[in-house]
Interface confidence: low
């Protein structure tokens, strides 16, 4: 639509001419209000009832009215009418897009005087070259201060050109800045390079922290040996307490890993319980990763120039839903070896596992298992089904993780997982299992351990043995005797000792002939049906100096048992006063029906058992 | 099963180097933060350096920095203390000794990345004298 | 630099005794950054505590630890003679990376 033709928008009395009333409806843009702006501000353009039949001067428009005038309507209006609306704008407060500012600015061709009067974010697009003297300048940019610089992107032409100058307006030479010159700056500041932070540090730092945009990388650099050379205003990070932190919350992600180390642990730890708790850091509802991921959570783009290019440790001071947006799952594939050494919470340990899980959804390659770290202790029985681990170092590794800790059932699905996939428990394997968890043999069924191929019992050690039972024994003891066969007599009773729970008599016999000195404790493991049959002169050749303690153990299985099957006069000749064998002129019958429906012997003999009293008198066997 | 064996001790005069190494067996030694502490003849404990478990981060007590390079060489389970410009007061039991992997008490946060010393050597012995 | 007070220097006991030893920082400590150790003549230290209060492996359950801040307790609930030996706190938690304390020893009354 055409604008009217050239007519002065405002009459001398201030009384509109109907012909500019129809501008201000389009220059407005009353005919199309900005939906944009006013769902960004909040503001609402307002409908055109009334305005034609009561026509007001500009100063008189509600901001609603003044909302949205595309830039096109601007363009045919005196520097003077623009002038005239744009103080307007001031007036009413209204929030203009960049655009509208830019056109704005376009208008004004000339340097305005009362720079105070016009919009604050206007000066923005001014060419600050048009406010060359100095106190043109200085008031130019004492108002720029206040306006918001963010408006404008980083690599912004306009905003290029501010802060050089600025500096010069301010007459900063060199890259030395005082606390005042930064104040000056205002926003500008966020846009010093690194020479200025390395320089002015002291002042510089805290201006840097409250920047509302990420760094560029060589302010990034600067801050960080600026951080970790330990001069003011922070002081060295050896001595920073929970309130330096919070102090420099903006700069967090900007520390590398040598200055996170040398952080007191305690402070980190502490700090970042706080800030867990603190709303303020938490994002809004809609974006925050809901603990199972559910697939419908809304996916958030990474902030500008928080890409993580390396997992390191400035990834810790990641909110979960920068780590899900800004780290990429197959760098974090790639370089799982490290985030066992970065102080992840559990929260963000769980993201970490969903990007990889999504990355992996059959199941993780072995190259990224065998770095998993502390990351296993999230993996859950069912992830670990999917996996295929093959390689003994990676069973290691992860052993090691829950090392000290009771067998979790992700450990122990881990184990079954490797066992099966090796087809038997080898001796490296057994070694290892063995070394990480001494009962893992004996948590094997029978059946189980007859898989067991005889070269890996040399892998097992007394205290692996400790809680198996009888029946285990019996299936693990004839594969030692196998293992240890070729062995001399002292050395192979030291291999074969632990083993012996599982004996029969013969090779308990056997035993007894070489000298071993069995001590009391392993007597004590023996099977009561290898014992029983045992003769004194038996017992006392096979514990050697040992038999002393039989004494002690006297009321206790298998002694107990053995006892009451010998001769009291055989017992007598041990000098130890065991007591509860048979009497001469005794009989001992040998009930094995009983025996075997009882599953004890029945011995005929004095005390709780069935005696049979066969009066053997001398004259009658004369 | 998992061993520390400190060796290179010895009597050396003021002034002078000597190396110590530590080699490690029974566990992953790539895995793990290593440290030397000694103890003085009848004196308490004394921590000397640290350094990670990939060797990018060492660290040193103030007594010896400037004068002890910890190192480590992971292809070789070795860890080394390298002793320059040597004084009586540096006469101690020197022990090498393993950062442990361990959990703290929040459940919050797994403070697994610092860590007590979990497992050390017998120790060896440097004397200091002119 | 936090310094580590370890208190008493010597304690007489007999066995089947309680044993109660202090370690007090001279700044506050975060609980999971302490730790205790055994020390016998002529031998390493063993680790007994890390966290303040977690045995390490191996350490039979008589021995416990407590505290936070500032104030930490080793506790020996009966006196085994093989307990008989000195006893260090450390912390590993602040710069420098690590301090011990002085110790305590232990002794047969």
């Known amino acids: 639509m055409a604008l009217p033709t050239a007519r002065p928008l405002l009459g001398s009395c201030g009384t509109p001419a109907l012909g500019s009333l129809l501008f201000l409806l389009f220059s407005l843009g009353w005919v199309q209000p900005s939906r944009t702006l006013a769902g960004e501000t909040g503001q609402e353009a307002a409908p055109l009832d009334g305005v034609l039949a009561n026509p007001p001067n500009i100063s008189s428009l509600s901001p609603r009215q003044l909302l949205g005038f595309p830039c096109a309507e601007v363009s045919g209006l005196s520097t003077e009418r623009v002038r005239e609306l744009a103080v307007a704008l001031a007036q009413k407060n209204v929030k203009l897009s960049t655009e509208q500012l830019r056109c704005l600015a376009h208008r004004l061709s000339e340097p305005p005087e009362d720079l105070d009067a016009l919009p604050l974010d206007l000066l923005l697009f001014l060419n600050p070259d048009a406010f060359s003297g100095p106190q043109a300048c200085t008031r130019f940019f004492s108002r720029i201060t206040k306006a918001n610089v963010d408006l404008l992107p980083r690599g912004a032409p306009e905003r290029q050109r501010l802060l050089p100058a600025a500096l010069a307006c301010w007459g900063v030479r060199g890259s030395l800045l005082s606390e005042a010159d930064v104040r000056a700056l205002g926003g500008l500041a966020c846009d010093l390079p690194g020479r200025f932070v390395a320089e002015s540090a002291e002042v510089l730092l805290p201006r840097l922290v409250s920047c509302p945009g990420p760094l560029d990388q060589d302010q990034q650099e600067a801050a960080r040996a600026a951080l970790q050379g330990g001069g003011p205003p922070y002081g060295p990070p050896s001595t920073w307490s929970v309130s330096t932190m919070d102090a420099l919350r903006g700069l967090l992600p900007v520390l590398g890993q040598p200055i996170i180390r040398s952080i007191p642990q305690g402070i980190v730890a502490a700090w970042r319980q706080r800030s867990s708790r603190d709303p303020s850091w938490r994002q809004p509802e809609r974006t925050i990763l809901r603990p199972r991921f559910r697939r419908e959570v809304e996916k958030t783009a990474c902030p500008s120039g928080k890409k993580a290019r390396e997992i390191d440790e400035s990834l810790i001071f990641y909110k979960k839903w920068e780590l899900e947006a800004c780290v990429d799952a197959a760098l974090l594939a790639t370089q799982m070896d490290r985030v066992n050494a970065i102080p992840f919470t559990y929260e963000q340990l769980d993201v970490l596992k969903h990007k990889l899980d999504e990355l992996y959804p059959q199941g993780y390659p072995e190259s990224v298992i065998q770095h998993l770290g502390y990351l296993f202790l999230k993996m859950s029985p069912e992830d670990i089904r999917k996996w295929n681990v093959t390689s003994l170092e990676t069973l290691k590794a992860l052993l090691e993780v829950n090392k000290g800790h009771e067998m979790s059932p992700q450990v122990a699905t881990l184990i079954d997982r490797f066992v099966k996939g090796r087809g038997q428990l080898d001796k490296d394997t057994l070694d290892t299992l063995t070394a990480f968890y001494p009962g893992y043999l004996c948590s094997l069924s029978p059946e189980e351990l007859s898989s067991v191929p005889p070269s890996s019992i040399w892998a097992v050690r007394p205290q692996d043995l400790d809680t198996c039972d009888p029946r285990q024994l019996d299936v693990l003891y004839p594969k030692a005797r196998l293992a240890f066969q070729n062995m001399n007599g002292s050395e192979y009773f030291v291999k074969i000792q632990s083993f012996l729970g599982g004996a029969p008599t013969e090779d308990l016999k056997a035993l007894s002939q070489q000298n071993v000195s069995m001590d009391l404790a392993t007597f004590m493991k023996l099977r009561t049906d290898a014992v029983l049959p045992l003769t004194v002169a038996e017992v006392q050749k096979l514990l050697g100096p040992h038999v002393e303690g039989l004494k002690a153990e006297e009321r206790h299985r298998p002694v107990r048992d053995w006892i009451l099957r010998q001769r009291q006069d055989d017992l007598d000749t041990l000098g130890l006063g065991l007591q509860g064998g048979i009497p001469n002129g005794y009989l001992v019958l040998d009930l094995s029906m009983q025996e075997a429906l009882s599953g004890t012997p029945c011995l005929l003999g004095p005390g709780p058992v069935l005696t049979v009293l066969a009066l053997l008198l001398a004259s009658t066997l004369a | 099963q998992v061993q520390l064996v400190e060796s290179g001790g010895g009597v050396v005069q003021p002034g002078r180097s000597l190396r110590l190494s530590c080699a490690a067996s029974g566990f992953t030694f790539s895995s793990y933060g290593m440290g030397w502490v000694r103890q003085a003849p009848g004196k308490c404990l004394e921590w000397v350096a640290v350094?990670?478990?990939?060797?990018?981060?060492?660290y040193y007590a103030e007594a010896v920095k400037g004068r002890f390079t910890i190192s480590r060489d992971n292809s070789k389970n070795t860890l080394y203390l390298q002793m320059n410009s040597l004084r009586a007061e540096d006469t101690a039991v020197y022990y090498c000794?393993?950062?442990?992997?361990?959990f703290g008490s929040g459940s919050y946060y797994p403070l697994y990345y610092y860590y007590a010393m979990d497992v050390w050597g017998q120790g060896t012995t440097v004397t200091v004298s002119s | 630099e936090i310094v580590l007070t370890q208190s008493p220097g010597t304690l007489s006991l007999s066995p089947g005794e309680r044993a109660t030893l202090s370690c007090r920082a001279s700044?506050?400590?975060?609980?999971?950054?302490l730790a205790w150790y055994q020390q016998k003549p002529g031998q390493a230290p063993r680790l007994l505590i890390y966290?303040?209060?977690i045995r390490a492996t191996g350490i039979p359950d008589r021995f416990s630890g407590s505290g936070s801040g500032t104030d930490f307790t080793l506790t020996i609930s009966r006196l085994e003679p093989e307990d008989f030996a000195v006893y260090y706190c450390?912390?590993?938690?602040?710069?420098?990376?690590?301090?011990f304390g002085c110790g305590t020893k232990v002794e047969i009354k």
């Open positions: 966290g303040a209060s």
């Open positions: 000794a393993r950062e442990g992997a361990h």
């Open positions: 350094i990670s478990y990939e060797a990018s981060n060492k």
């Open positions: 700044q506050s400590v975060s609980s999971s950054y």
């Open positions: 450390q912390q590993y938690g602040s710069s420098p990376i690590f301090t």
